[in-house]
């Protein structure tokens, strides 16, 4: 799995982003782990990465993953100063020049290396569930999340806001 | 334009209820996270309550857990502070504020101007 | 519980000085901060967040830096109407305020 070392190779360069044409307005590392408190691991393997939902061993290094926060302008026809209707949209990278990418054809989440601009499949919504949990909507289909299935990362459909609070589309990020 | 306008302050004795309103126009009131926030005469800032946009998940200040309520009507465009068994250290002003973001709890893009609430015997 | 602690208390500078407030966490915060502004008598106003992004409207005189525990906000030119009582805020972990510093012309 990658440890940090992975990460400390991005230079103070921030990403574009193809939802606004601008820099990040945020980045910092974090590691991501299910509500339940399994890690999301990375790890190469046959020349792709893999990614894993994992309880880690006692002592065992978690994973860092690059968040980078966008500002998107909502598609709606509120007033305002351009302040009201925004959305956050998050980029997620575990090592340089790979990042988390939604693949909706498989529902699946796969680690793609690719060149910025990012592809939309790279963006997801950010929500906050709870004060310290997010879920990540896909950019590319609304209703759709990242969530926990199998001991691995897929994408889920959530039909109702009442299904939000699954516990299994809810993830905590922390920097240790 | 956003607005947020707060109502039901106002001077009520120790132990006893008080229920604050806050209507909002001008945004898409079910997209935000909305929130309670206090100030004491003279004093700072205080977090009270926190309401995610679809009204599930509810934050309080340790100090007020048990006694306050937070809710909302998202048809009605209204969030609700309900107090109960009231004390003199909830004397303040009451601020209603949105968040920055649909469905995230990041920042207070806008404020109310806030309603009085005096705790006295 | 997160913690804020700003400093100074009160700051008081001539018209046209460059101004630096502090805020310090007790943890770890991953620039998710905020710069309030409260003039008397008035509501507080979104000034700077995520740590150095300005709120649309707001002069640009205002700036915002800091990472991991500490954070600054700065006014590079201090004008009369900047009187008012600042507010760091932190929503990283909870949501937690600074005590607030308050900034009076000379």
């Known amino acids: 799995a990658f440890g940090i070392s992975g990460v400390q190779k991005y230079t103070r360069a921030l990403h574009d982003s193809s939802i606004t044409g601008i820099s990040p307005i945020t980045e910092y590392l974090a590691s991501l782990s299910t509500y339940n408190d399994q890690s999301i691991t990375f790890a190469l393997e046959d020349e792709s990465y893999e990614i894993y939902v994992e309880d880690l061993k006692k002592d065992e290094k978690k994973d860092k993953v690059l968040l980078s926060y966008y500002e998107s302008q909502h598609p709606s026809n509120e007033s305002g100063d351009g302040v009201d209707g925004k959305m956050l949209m998050v980029t997620l990278s575990p090592t340089k020049d790979f990042w988390l990418h939604a693949n909706n054809k498989e529902h699946s989440v796969e680690l793609h290396k690719c060149e910025k601009p990012l592809p939309d499949q790279a963006f997801f919504v950010l929500h906050n569930m709870h004060s310290n949990c997010v879920s990540f909507e896909c950019k590319t289909d609304p209703g759709v999340f990242i969530g926990v299935k199998d001991n691995h990362l897929a994408l889920i459909k959530v039909d109702s806001s009442e299904n939000l609070c699954t516990e299994n589309i809810l993830f905590k990020l922390s920097e240790t | 334009e956003v607005q947020l306008v707060e109502t039901g302050g106002g001077l009520v004795q120790p132990g006893r209820s008080l229920k604050l309103s806050c209507v909002a126009s001008?945004?898409?009131?079910?997209?935000?996270?909305m929130y309670w926030i206090r100030q004491a005469p003279g004093m700072g800032l205080e977090w009270v309550s926190s309401?995610?946009?679809?009204?599930?998940?509810?934050y309080y200040l340790d100090s007020v857990k048990g006694r306050f309520t937070i809710s909302r009507n998202n048809a009605e465009n209204t969030v609700y502070l309900q107090m109960n068994s009231l004390r003199s250290e909830d004397t303040a002003t009451y601020y209603c504020?949105?968040?920055?973001?649909?469905?995230?709890?990041?920042?207070?893009?806008?404020w109310g101007q806030g309603t009085l609430v005096t705790v006295s015997s | 519980d997160i913690q804020m602690t700003q400093s100074p208390s009160v700051l008081s500078a001539s018209v046209g000085d460059r101004v630096t407030l502090s805020c310090k966490a007790s943890?770890?915060?991953?620039?998710?901060l905020d710069w309030y502004q409260q003039k008397v008598g008035e509501a507080p106003k979104l000034l700077i967040y995520f740590t150095n992004n300005l709120q649309t409207g707001i002069p640009s005189r205002f700036s915002g830096s800091g990472s991991g525990t500490d954070y600054t906000l700065t006014i590079s030119s201090l004008q009369p109407e900047d009187v008012a009582t600042y507010f760091c805020?932190?929503?990283?972990?909870?949501?937690?305020f600074g005590q607030g510093t308050k900034v009076e012309i000379k």
């Open positions: 504020a949105k968040g920055r973001y649909y469905y995230s709890s990041y920042s207070f893009a806008y």
């Open positions: 001008g945004f898409t009131f079910s997209n935000y996270w």
């Open positions: 943890h770890n915060i991953n620039k998710h």
């Open positions: 309401i995610n946009n679809d009204g599930g998940n509810t």
């Open positions: 805020f932190q929503y990283n972990s909870g949501w937690t």
